[in-house]
């Protein structure tokens, strides 16, 4: 079952998916000057059996010959301030993401594919939050939000973790980190805030794979 | 309570344009995706996609992409579907109804009939 | 794009009537939910995630199944009940209905 809504936003806090569950679509979007192969599926899926997961149909773009007519939604100039671009390392490489079942890894890239990936989750998968470079993550809890369905609305849980101005950026699940104690600490208003826009990830992988460099971009 | 109000009915001419509203009101139109559904006469539900109204980001049904557009202004609580160069064929009952998951409301329906 | 078939097209039925309505997938999906239409009028949640009654809906509408198969079942129609029932799915994109199926009067 698709999430009708978009997991929380935090403030100078990006987050990504480990592994997708499956049921989660990735649209097939490709950079200006390119379209998608008229017969090319607009998503990929993540569907699999009980033993393995994969992503089924594959995006492919093609030059457009004639003016591209594909609808794009262009931010603001106000909605331009809000990207980030944060360097995360993680000790999590691409290439040994450990193959949770039921779950499909990060699909590679494709030719000519746009800079930012939009995902659609599904009930149940989790996601995970990262202060950006040159904040401190205070914890009150899990730093993850797990899409839920209740009579038939889903929702994302609120997750619990803070961003403070501090140099160290904090690191991903299952990475040392120092844990604070806040709490004496109100939630701000701004962690609160549930965005209801689609979170589009644009990823760079270093050749050394040990570096995600994320933009995100609430449209 | 929740109320999605629709504009009224419209007539056009092939290969003109139509732009039907939908009014929220009773909850936080930035907290829901508005989806908008097509019954042509005699015939089935159809989703053609939906507008998160907070950025105005849209999915669309492929089958739709390139006929309809959806848009939303925040400082109305309003979501709009633009139909473009009209047929007979999209003749039709056109239905904005609120997400977040299955949709517990619905507008009451706008009727564009196109005919020359 | 996930399939919905609903079987019958159209149900000729009397009140007290027990009445049961299919719906199939093409692929296996999460949940159903079932809308019913009346002429004239949006369509109004009936049941959602396959089994759950939506608020002021009556005990006598029930849902069932799993996968690819799924039972809308009302179990002893009323006066009320005569109208077109919808299935739905929204496990994946582009969101499907089933082509409806009309309960009238025999």
């Known amino acids: 079952e698709l999430c009708d809504d978009d997991p929380p936003k935090i403030t100078h806090a990006t987050f990504k998916a480990v592994a997708y569950k499956e049921g989660t679509m990735l649209n097939c979007e490709c950079k200006r000057g390119f379209r998608r192969i008229k017969s090319g599926s607009p998503y990929m899926l993540c569907t699999g059996n009980s033993s393995h997961s994969s992503w089924d149909n594959q995006c492919q773009c093609t030059s457009s010959a004639a003016r591209n007519t594909t609808k794009q939604v262009t931010p603001q100039p106000e909605e331009q301030k809000e990207r980030k671009t944060t360097e995360m390392q993680s000790q999590m490489q691409l290439a040994d993401q450990v193959s949770l079942p039921g779950h499909c890894r990060e699909p590679p890239p494709w030719e000519n594919e746009a800079t930012e990936r939009i995902y659609h989750f599904v009930v149940g998968q989790t996601v995970y939050y990262q202060c950006v470079q040159g904040y401190r993550a205070l914890h009150r809890g899990p730093a993850e939000s797990v899409c839920k369905m209740t009579h038939g609305k889903t929702r994302w849980t609120q997750p619990q973790l803070i961003c403070t101005g501090e140099t160290e950026p904090s690191q991903f699940p299952g990475e040392e980190e120092p844990q604070a104690s806040p709490d004496g600490l109100p939630e701000s208003e701004t962690s609160r805030l549930v965005t209801t826009t689609d979170f589009r990830i644009q990823t760079e992988v270093a050749a050394t794979m040990e570096t995600f460099i994320f933009t995100t971009e609430y449209q | 309570q929740v109320q999605l109000v629709q504009s009224g009915a419209e007539v056009k001419k092939p290969g003109s344009s139509v732009k039907v509203s939908c009014k929220a009101s009773g909850y936080t139109f930035t907290s829901y995706r508005m989806h908008w559904v097509r019954q042509a006469p005699g015939q089935g539900l159809e989703w053609m996609g939906y507008?998160?109204?907070?950025?105005?980001?849209?999915e669309y049904n492929q089958k739709f992409k390139d006929k309809a557009t959806i848009t939303a202004d925040e400082s109305t609580n309003t979501a709009y579907m633009e139909l473009s160069s009209l047929r007979s064929e999209d003749t039709a009952v056109y239905y904005c109804?609120?997400?977040?998951?299955?949709?517990?409301?619905w507008g009451q329906g706008t009727l564009v009939t196109v005919s020359s | 794009d996930i399939q919905m078939t609903q079987s019958p097209s159209t149900l000729s039925a009397s009140v007290g009537d027990r009445v049961t309505i299919t719906c199939s997938a093409s692929?296996?999906?999460?949940?159903m939910h079932w809308y019913q239409q009346k002429p004239g009028k949006a369509p109004k949640l009936l049941i959602y995630?396959?089994?759950e009654l939506a608020s002021g809906v009556p005990a006598r509408f029930s849902g069932s199944g799993s996968g690819t198969e799924f039972t809308l079942t009302i179990s002893s129609l009323q006066p009320d009940d005569f109208a077109t029932y919808y299935c739905?799915?929204?496990?994946?994109?582009?969101?499907?209905f089933g082509q409806g199926t009309k309960v009238e009067v025999k």
């Open positions: 507008i998160k109204p907070s950025r105005g980001y849209t």
């Open positions: 739905h799915q929204r496990s994946t994109y582009p969101l499907t």
């Open positions: 692929s296996s999906i999460s949940y």
């Open positions: 109804a609120r997400g977040g998951g299955v949709f517990d409301y």
């Open positions: 995630t396959t089994s």
